[in-house]
């Protein structure tokens, strides 16, 4: 278990021409809030698919009124972090969607109007317990700067929050074969209680004797990679997964990555993602300081004056990895809209637009929205030769004239009540039930039927759906 934390640093106009108009005005002051949605793996799922790792909504930012004639500055932000608790292992690879919402504070009776200003998405590798990772994402003419990290909740530790720490039984040292739990030096790593042979890299357990697999791995000991290719094996598809089992040993079997590196398959071989202080094909080179020049591709090395202290590589645009060793395939994120062709020039991305589209990301349809109106605070989105409305929360249809009722499908189980709150669907559970959709009965002794309740979740707790 642990928490993914997101800190928004700024939201404002991006560099370059075509600065966006301020979203607020003296006539219509507004404030911002943010929504983050996390999904495990490097999935390219639609924005509407479930936030399987979790989601969070920020507080509202300060009210902002545009100064007439002034360009849009960085807009005032809500205080605090967005926190997304996760109950199981941290998957290591994840996809995110961060949405910037505008709340208009006009004098409309019955409350404000909400509209989506910008949505950014990405796919990242991240080890739990590591430092804050900084990121910049652009959506149209807007730029969002943010940092994120994943941290484990005690007693969990490790890059996937699957190792456990326990207080020391003796004051001086840990038991045989057990290491101190950095950074909790007064605690010791708990003995492994998983099923014998359970892969330490790809499996984890929450109860003694079990072996649960991280995404991409299967088999009783989580040693078999799941292939996403079509099933050519005579064994056919595995009933345990939606993919297929690759017969025989995979390139990552036995984990060829040394020094705690994690292995991932590539089409022809494998790739090791090394912890700080190690590099090389199999993370076998160690004791590195900045004097050794560990940062590739023009990365800037910081810290690490002696072999015992870690160095950090600050990578130039287009490169990533703990040693800036990996070229970012920025075109894989499909930044060019409306069928534009993506060209990664190394120093910059270029989009070659189809006829009828323009803009750095081919986001402008040259005349789709001319004279079009979206009702109820919706905004017109150009694309595909026909205008489309991005509707405010609670509205739907081609022109946002239809009221959308997220409760129509009766999502709250066991007699729970569903409310169409502006922040998303809300369930109020009937007595005796709990959970996001009131799906878990509360046992008479007060325990729930959940395998393990997430931190802070009590019987009768509501859950918000975003």
């Amino acid at each position: 278990a642990g928490v993914f934390e997101l800190q928004i640093h700024s939201f404002g106009p991006g560099p370059g021409p075509g600065a966006p108009r301020s979203p607020c005005s003296a006539r219509l002051p507004c404030r911002l809030f943010f929504r983050v949605c996390l999904k495990p793996g490097l999935s390219e799922e639609a924005a509407e698919s479930p936030c399987a790792l979790g989601a969070a909504l920020s507080a509202r930012g300060p009210v902002y009124t545009e100064q007439p004639g002034a360009p849009a500055p960085d807009l005032p932000l809500p205080d605090g972090l967005l926190q997304v608790p996760f109950r199981d292992a941290w998957p290591g690879t994840f996809s995110f969607i961060i949405e910037t919402w505008r709340e208009e504070l006009g004098d409309q009776i019955g409350g404000p109007a909400w509209s989506l200003l910008a949505r950014v998405a990405g796919r990242r590798r991240l080890a739990a317990g590591g430092p804050w990772a900084r990121d910049i994402q652009r959506a149209g003419a807007w730029e969002l700067r943010f940092s994120y990290r994943a941290r484990c909740e005690p007693p969990a530790v490790g890059t996937a929050c699957t190792r456990l720490c326990r207080p020391r039984s003796a004051p001086s040292r840990c038991g045989p074969g057990l290491r101190p739990c950095a950074p909790l030096e007064d605690e010791c790593e708990a003995p492994l209680v998983c099923r014998a042979g359970c892969s330490p890299e790809h499996g984890f357990c929450e109860q003694p004797g079990e072996c649960r697999c991280l995404e991409g791995w299967t088999g009783p000991l989580c040693t078999v990679p799941v292939s996403t290719s079509s099933c050519l094996s005579p064994r056919g598809p595995s009933s345990a997964t939606t993919g297929c089992l690759v017969p025989g040993p995979g390139p990552c079997d036995g984990n060829p990555c040394a020094n705690g590196g994690s292995c991932s398959e590539t089409p022809r071989s494998f790739e090791c993602t090394c912890p700080r202080g190690f590099y090389g094909l199999r993370c076998e080179v160690s004791g590195v300081t900045c004097a050794d020049g560990p940062c590739f591709n023009g990365g800037l090395c910081v810290g690490g004056a002696d072999p015992d202290s870690a160095y950090i590589c600050h990578c130039p645009p287009g490169f990533q990895g703990s040693n800036c060793e990996k070229r970012v395939d920025r075109c894989s994120l499909q930044p060019c809209r409306n069928g534009g062709l993506c060209l990664d020039l190394g120093h910059a991305l270029r989009c070659r637009c189809r006829a009828g589209f323009a803009g750095p990301r081919c986001e402008h349809d040259l005349d789709d929205c001319a004279g079009r109106a979206c009702a109820n605070g919706g905004t017109c989105v150009e694309g595909g030769g026909a205008h489309r409305c991005s509707c405010a929360l609670g509205f739907g249809g081609r022109d946002c004239r239809e009221r959308a009722d997220p409760c129509a499908a009766r999502p709250c189980a066991h007699g729970g009540r569903c409310y169409a709150h502006f922040s998303g669907l809300v369930c109020a559970c009937a007595p005796g039930y709990m959970g996001a959709r009131c799906e878990f009965p509360v046992h008479p002794d007060g325990a729930s039927a959940l395998p393990a309740a997430p931190p802070g979740l009590r019987p009768g707790d509501p859950q918000r759906y975003l």
Epitope: I109, G110, G111, R403, D405, C407, R410, R417, C418, Y419, A420, H421, F422, S423, V426, A428, C429, A430, P431, R458, G460, D461, P462
Partner: antibody, heavy 119, light 110 residues
């Protein structure tokens, strides 16, 4: 624009039944929320009477109101009703209808209607 | 029956003062934070200030803030202004779809 408006008799006699109407505009009964009735005796605090949940038209009442209060709603006319039987002078109050769309708070209120119970 | 007790029931303070009103429930509110605060002036319906214990309603000045969870909650007015003279009510929502209001706190400007 979204609003609620209560209406009903200003004066009723003891032992009679009071029927109040709450008409709303700018939103539909077909979406899911609670329509509640709250009253306030002169110089006193707010007192919850009961609610109707528009998702399934189930009702909940304050313990003192069970058996005396009946809340109903009619989607076709965008109206909610509250009946209070066996009136006594202590029922003299301003009666409000209010809406909850989640997290248990009333974000939208009517202006209220004063009902006096007197012979 | 569930009781919500507000204290004090009356307070007099000067413009610029920091004012704190507490609300104590005999039962934990649903979800531990389904508690709201309202302001009411004579002849007007209540106006929502805070929902879900600490969320400021749109258009409400930032000098108002709420905190607390479970059974104990607080409304704070950071720098009292003349227009804040009113009666303030807390209201909880409870398992079983039950609502309850506190008795109210009348705030007067000295």
């Amino acid at each position: 624009q979204v609003q609620l408006k209560e209406s009903g008799p200003a004066l009723v006699k003891p032992t009679q039944t009071l029927t109040l109407t709450c008409t709303f505009s700018g939103f539909s009964l077909s979406s899911s929320y609670d329509m509640g009735w709250v009253r306030q005796a002169p110089g006193q605090g707010l007192e919850w009477m009961g609610t109707i949940y528009t998702g399934d038209y189930s009702t909940d009442y304050a313990s003192w109101a069970k058996g005396r209060v009946t809340i109903t709603a009619d989607e076709s006319t965008s109206t909610a009703y509250m009946e209070l039987s066996s009136l006594r002078s202590e029922d003299t109050a301003v009666y409000y209808c209010a809406r909850n769309t989640g997290y248990g708070y009333f974000g939208l209120w009517g202006q209220g209607t004063l009902v006096t119970v007197s012979s | 029956d569930i009781q919500l007790t507000q204290s004090p029931s009356f307070l007099s303070a000067s413009v610029g003062d920091r004012v704190t009103i507490t609300c104590q429930s005999t039962e934990s509110v649903y979800g531990s934070d389904w508690l709201s605060w309202y302001q009411q002036k004579p002849g007007q319906p209540p106006k929502l200030l805070i929902y879900q214990a600490s969320n400021l309603e749109i258009g409400v000045p930032s000098r108002f803030s709420g905190s607390g969870s479970g059974t104990d909650f607080t409304l704070t007015i950071n720098s009292l202004e003349a227009e804040d003279a009113a009666t303030y009510y807390c209201q909880g929502y409870y398992s079983g779809y039950i609502y309850a209001f506190g008795g109210g706190t009348k705030v007067e400007i000295k």
